[in-house]
Interface confidence: medium
């Protein structure tokens, strides 16, 4: 395993009062490997509402870099391939679990927490408001 | 807190050689609450690859309940509102991290797993196969 | 850049173990883990296993279960591999190379090496 | 294990000339193929990830795709650097796996 210098505030994980704390076996379980999904590789430039995917970096948390998504454009790719700005490109969210590692530097203590990411684009048909 | 009948086959924590184990805090921090995201709510109706929400529930599973997203149609809608099989509504797919009980039934020992969600969907232009 | 400088060249015998370093600088050690891969003389490249340094998770190849050995230190930024009972199939050039903690596209997923150490030159003969 | 087969293991060639080497898995895996150069004795270095990006400072000759099962590596216009092995690499479901290599050498 790792050997990690550790914080001298961290917690004693045989403390009761520990707050709502479990123990985790780290030895990811990949629940997909039977299935053989068919990927999400080339959506990213195939869709009519493309994405670029950006970095985001954080050294105490698990995963370390997660790419974000971020639509191309405001409006969707039509039939001649140009950008329709009767539609629009909007980016599909959800909530992920990390591990971040706290008290920072304990080599055995995390929490969960839940971050939203930009996993893709679709193309939407867009609210129009009439002002009266 | 919820009560779960204890397996008399549950590790103890304070095993020292519980495999690749750590304390995990489940007071679950969420990072989005500042940022009041736009919510991708109604998308899933009004996107050109629309999409159904189906409830996957597993109770010994961290999040218990996960919506997936299932494509309503083979093609995406086009302007006049019928489904165009030229184009193709493919489902934009995403791994979560969820802690999975192990041995099941144990209150307070998990394992961390992937699974591969679908998130919504995307309208793609079709990988055409020429036969020579 | 990330850097990544291996230890020297070993000479072993039949049975003997064997443990190389991998010093990594530039970067956040923990945001990445650490591969070996080795290269037999005039083959191609074979992946023995894998520690992620954010919490020290490890995987090995098959092959190599029960005969590898591959741990981290945080504080000299450092990774090593032991390799147990080598025979003269394990003489090889083993390199470390860097493997970053990403979610792609919507993937938590072992990923590309983007960074090597120079090599260690490893060879077991009686 | 997933079996990664390049093809050709070697190919000869003239400077400014397209080289295409190719690479087939077993099962499908998604994207996540990568590329590497290795020059006699020295370490591979990263070319291509996740089949079709470049990776920093690499040549913008060099390029790949596909997705599945079946990849391609592209050299637009070979220089004589370009001279090495070429592997590809999956990282999808461990063992990671490596294909055979294919010898690149200049005319």
């Known amino acids: 395993g790792i050997t990690i210098p550790r914080n001298p505030g961290c917690p004693n994980s045989e403390d009761k009062n520990f707050p709502r704390t479990v123990m985790v076996n780290l030895n990811i379980h990949n629940r997909n490997t039977n299935t053989n999904p068919k990927r999400s590789s080339d959506y990213y430039n195939r869709s009519t509402s493309p994405w670029n995917l950006h970095r985001n970096e954080d050294p105490e948390r698990y995963p370390s870099v997660i790419w974000e998504a971020k639509c191309r454009h405001l409006g969707c790719i039509n039939a001649d391939g140009n950008v329709d700005y009767h539609m629009n490109s909007v980016p599909i969210q959800q909530e992920i679990l990390v591990l971040r590692r706290e008290p920072p530097h304990c080599p055995n203590s995390f929490r969960l927490e839940k971050i939203l990411v930009s996993v893709g684009c679709t193309c939407v048909t867009p609210i129009v408001h009439h002002v009266a | 807190g919820i009560t779960i009948p204890r397996n008399p086959g549950c590790p103890n924590s304070e095993d020292k050689n519980f495999p690749r184990t750590v304390m995990v805090n489940l007071n679950i921090h969420n990072r989005n609450t500042n940022t009041n995201p736009k919510r991708s709510s109604d998308y899933y109706n009004r996107s050109t690859s629309p999409w159904n929400l189906h409830r996957n529930e597993d109770p010994e599973r961290y999040p218990s309940v996960i919506w997936e997203a299932k494509c309503r149609h083979l093609g995406c809608i086009n302007a006049d509102g019928n489904v165009d099989y030229h184009m193709n509504s493919v489902p934009i797919q995403q791994e979560i991290l969820v802690l999975r009980r192990e041995p099941p039934h144990c209150p307070n020992s998990f394992r961390l797993e992937k699974i591969l969600v679908s998130v919504g969907c995307t309208c793609v232009t079709p990988i055409v196969h020429h036969v020579a | 850049e990330v850097q990544l400088v291996q230890s020297g060249a070993e000479v072993k015998k039949p049975g003997e173990s064997l443990k190389i370093s991998c010093k990594a600088s530039?970067?956040?050690?923990?945001?990445?883990?650490i591969s070996w891969v080795r290269q037999a003389p005039g083959q191609g490249l074979e992946w023995m296993g894998g520690?992620?340094?954010?919490?020290?998770?490890?995987d090995y190849a098959q092959k190599f279960q029960g005969r590898v050995t591959i741990t981290a230190d945080e504080s000299t930024t450092t990774a090593y591999m032991e390799l147990s009972g080598l025979t003269s199939d394990d003489t090889a050039v083993y390199y470390c190379?860097?493997?970053?903690?990403?979610?792609?596209?919507?993937?938590?997923?072992?990923?590309?090496?983007?960074?090597w150490g120079q090599g260690t030159t490893v060879t077991v003969s009686s | 294990e997933i079996v990664l087969t390049q093809s050709p293991d070697f190919q000869s060639v003239t400077p400014k000339e397209k080289v295409t080497i190719t690479c087939r898995a077993s099962?499908?895996?998604?994207?996540?193929l990568h590329w590497y150069q290795q020059k006699p004795d020295q370490s591979p270095k990263l070319l291509i990830k996740?089949?079709?990006h470049s990776n920093p400072g690499v040549p913008s000759r060099f390029s790949g795709s596909g997705s599945g099962t079946d990849f391609t590596l592209t050299i637009n216009g070979l220089e004589a650097e370009d001279a090495g092995t070429y592997y590809c690499?999956?990282?999808?479901?461990?063992?990671?796996?490596f294909g055979q290599g294919t010898k690149v050498d200049i005319k």
């Open positions: 190379a860097r493997e970053p903690n990403e979610f792609w596209n919507g993937y938590y997923t072992t990923h590309d090496f983007d960074a």
């Open positions: 530039g970067g956040s050690f923990r945001s990445y883990g």
């Open positions: 520690i992620t340094n954010f919490f020290g998770a490890v």
């Open positions: 099962q499908d895996i998604g994207a996540a």
């Open positions: 996740y089949a079709s």
């Open positions: 690499h999956q990282s999808d479901i461990l063992p990671q796996t």
